[in-house]
Amino acid sequence: CKAMHVAQPAVVLASSRGIASFVCEYASPGKATEVRVTVLRQADSQVTEVCAATYMMGNELTFLDDSICTGTSSGNQVNLTIQGLRAMDTGLYICKVELMYPPPYYLGIGNGTQIYVIDPEPCPDSDF
């Protein structure tokens, strides 16, 4: 297993609709054809997997149908979008990149993107 540098923004504020997008960029030492991207969430010392996708270079990322993540790839960059976020989902979202094929296997873990989610103010009751 060889180490690889992964860069991601330090902090992002999600939209009022609970959507957060950020770029995860990895310094690929070789010409990988198969890449796996995993998003981990760390909050209060707990780490949980949010979503993961394996893709062939030049193809779209495919997450599971019920995943809250979507993404696109361009060269050594992955554009990740996480949706359906609420205030309770605020935390550090860490991008983990694995170059699966061809060998050697490379692993890179970013420092994390602190995503803040602000629940929208409830609308005042109306008479209509």
Epitope: P9, A10, V11, V12, L13, A14, S15, S16, S21, F22, A43, D44, A87, M88, T90, G91, Q114, Y116, I118, D119
Partner: antibody, heavy 116, light 108 residues
């Protein structure tokens, strides 16, 4: 090294607007947030809000909502805070700071005096 | 809005003594997202602690933070002359983010 340099002191009349700038250097501007905090003379710190320089999304203190606007110019790595309809109790030192989880780097502060 | 109440308002101690500052929240602070700042007259605040217990870069280990939920503490194990200042807590776990009113640590 990381530096945040704010614009100079301002004297404004009640009802006017003020726009304070905060120029960042020494780091990747769009990777961080900019938080704004003010401090009235002899008083404590008051959080005003923050902006994500990555996407421009903002979160304002409710008491300032409608009067405050925070923006960034990523081409010059500068953040701006505009406060409208100024009142005498807006007299304060206004600070910007680089935000992730706490403000680790601060500007030097901008004194805004509101007086007729 | 979470109200942070700092106590005591003023702490009179001598250099070398231990200082214990409290910050109580009106409701639980999510993810232990609480920071402590030090401020000296005429200067911008300085971040000491974030995430309730993580020391910021370059902060001496005599400063430590602890707590969760609604009760947080900043401890200065042995006061140095340069530690006499005003200390603020700030929560950023629940919007709107808020500061406490401050605790002044003065020389006895």
């Amino acid at each position: 090294q990381v530096q945040l340099v704010q614009s100079g002191a301002e004297v404004k009349k009640p009802g006017a607007s003020v726009k304070v700038s905060c120029k960042a250097s020494g780091y990747t501007f769009t990777s961080y947030g900019i938080s704004w905090v003010r401090q009235a003379p002899g008083q404590g710190l008051e959080w005003m809000g923050w902006i994500s320089a990555y996407n421009g999304n903002t979160n304002y203190a409710q008491k300032l909502q409608g009067r405050v606007t925070m923006t960034t110019d990523t081409s010059t790595s500068t953040a701006y805070m505009e406060l409208r309809s100024l009142r005498s109790d807006d007299t304060a030192v206004y600070y910007c700071g680089r935000w992730v989880r706490g403000v680790e780097y601060w500007g030097q502060g901008t004194l805004v005096t509101v007086s007729s | 809005e979470i109200v942070l109440t700092q106590s005591p308002a003023t702490l009179s101690l001598s250099p070398g003594e231990r200082a214990t500052l409290s910050c109580g929240a009106s409701q639980s602070v999510n993810n232990r997202y609480l920071a402590w700042y030090q401020q000296k007259p005429g200067l911008a605040p300085r971040l000491l602690i974030y995430d309730a217990s993580t020391r910021a870069t370059g902060i001496p280990d005599r400063f430590s933070g602890s707590g969760s939920g609604t009760d947080f503490t900043l401890t200065i194990s042995r006061l140095e002359p340069e530690d006499f200042a005003v200390y603020y807590c700030q929560q950023y776990g629940n919007s709107p983010w808020t500061f406490g009113q401050g605790t002044k640590v003065e020389i006895k």
